[in-house]
Amino acid sequence: QAAPFPELCSYTWEAVDTKNNVLYKINICGSVDIVQCGPSSAVCMHDLKTRTYHSVGDSVLRSATRSLLEFNTTVSCDQQGTNHRVQSSIAFLCGKTLGTPEFVTATECVHYFEWRTTAACKKDIFKANKEVPCYVFDEELRKHDLNPLIKLSGAYDVDDSDPDTSLFINVCRDIDTLRDPGSQLRACPPGTAACLVRGHQAFDVGQPRDGLKVVRKDRLVLSYVREEAGKLDFCDGHSPAVTITFVCPSERREGTIPKLTAKSNCRYEIEWITEYACHRDYLESKTCSLSGEQQDVSIDLTPLAQSGGSSYISDGKEYLFYLNVCGETEIQFCNKKQAAVCQVKKSDTSQVKAAGRYHNQTLRYSDGDLTLIYFGGDECSSGFQRMSVINFECNKTAGNDGKGTPVFTGEVDCTYFFTWDTEYACVHHHHHH
């Protein structure tokens, strides 16, 4: 049986059940290389409390559809009066990066995971030439996730203080020059994740090979190498390589750009101080507030919730967007869709789409940017579920009793962007973390 998602096959992936202190290792095409789980385990559960391993999915007992992968075992589970076996179930949804498997829950018999990934899309528009896993768990099982830094087009310009060259990088995947053919990047070879531009020439100095690694609690490392043997004439016989170290800052701060810290014989070392390198719980909340020791800040957007059936309205030329954030009030146009953002076509108001649902909510404060994300909306033709990204700005003189109002700024591949100036986005900082 052919592997259902070949792009995901090259790696053993990890997911964590934080509540029960369990680490899962997942290999969807072969078996995980963990002796204690046996030779054919595709999903191996490592219970850190008891230091034991249990196979909860066998690679031989795999069944697949386009959006669901199930691994059975021969281990019976004691659900009263039934003959069930322990199994793992992975639901796949279209995403814009390779993404990460997320543990959802586990019953007596089934361990459930969800995975938003380019591999599950109906069209190839989000697929990279080369992409590697872009997250890691530290020794305390806290997730560090650089997926939000991945550029789907264009690249980051590294601060290298060399007037004659420019070094451009992407995170965990190659630079897509076709979707954003900036003049400098146009000459970059396909597949490169680190592109050195000298005058009108561009050189591949590194492609992603291995996934993100953690070297210390707040330092993550990504390595790129130039795969083909052909040496570049300015590298003194060495093969080019790029090492990017992502550093979680010791206190809350604005974002910085990646900086070149060392360069020798086409070996480039880059340091990037970014809060995305911090563990995810430091940056994100599933509610509309971020507060407490964990996050070093106090943010509460719950006063922006509208009651009594009213919504914020944002004009998007062809469409009107109705928003009701930080609550579970149905938007009337999007009745029964559980939408936090509802897109209505002006020329035909019967054409209504959920552009993100209120129970699929993430509030993120990272590198000085405050963002509220709603995902899991109605599908586009690519299979990607519509989502909305609301970027908040602090404005102590915002109208509408300080609440302000969202402004639609654009759409890219079924992701809708808004800006929102409000006094409730004014962040109160605490002490060090």
Epitope: D17, K19, N20, N21, K49, D78, T107, C109, H111
Partner: nanobody, 116 residues
Framework: DVQLVESGGGLVQPGGSLRLSCAAS????????MDWYRQAPGKQREWVAT???????TYADSVKGRFTISRDNAKNTVYLQMNSLRPEDTAVYYC??????????WGQGTLVTVSS
Amino acid sequence: DVQLVESGGGLVQPGGSLRLSCAASGIIFSDNRMDWYRQAPGKQREWVATLASYGWKTYADSVKGRFTISRDNAKNTVYLQMNSLRPEDTAVYYCKASSPVLNDIWGQGTLVTVSS
């Protein structure tokens, strides 16, 4: 005050059965992962069974097919049903509760003796 109290231990013949109980107080019981451990005389404490907060269960190889862990959230109690007992199951049995927000909490233990 957070505490766990085990009961149900005693003397039983080989091949017999016992049901151990572990009553919890002072914690949101359903949020906690519950484990049973045991310590035989002169030996190290060993893990026996786990019932996670979501409901999945795992067992040590030595008790698989003979022991069953379960919980009653209404009674804040976790049980260990032990069938086909063997002399090597003789030990003090402890229950443990753990969650991301709490340090591990142990009970005081209950003695199980399997002897003819």
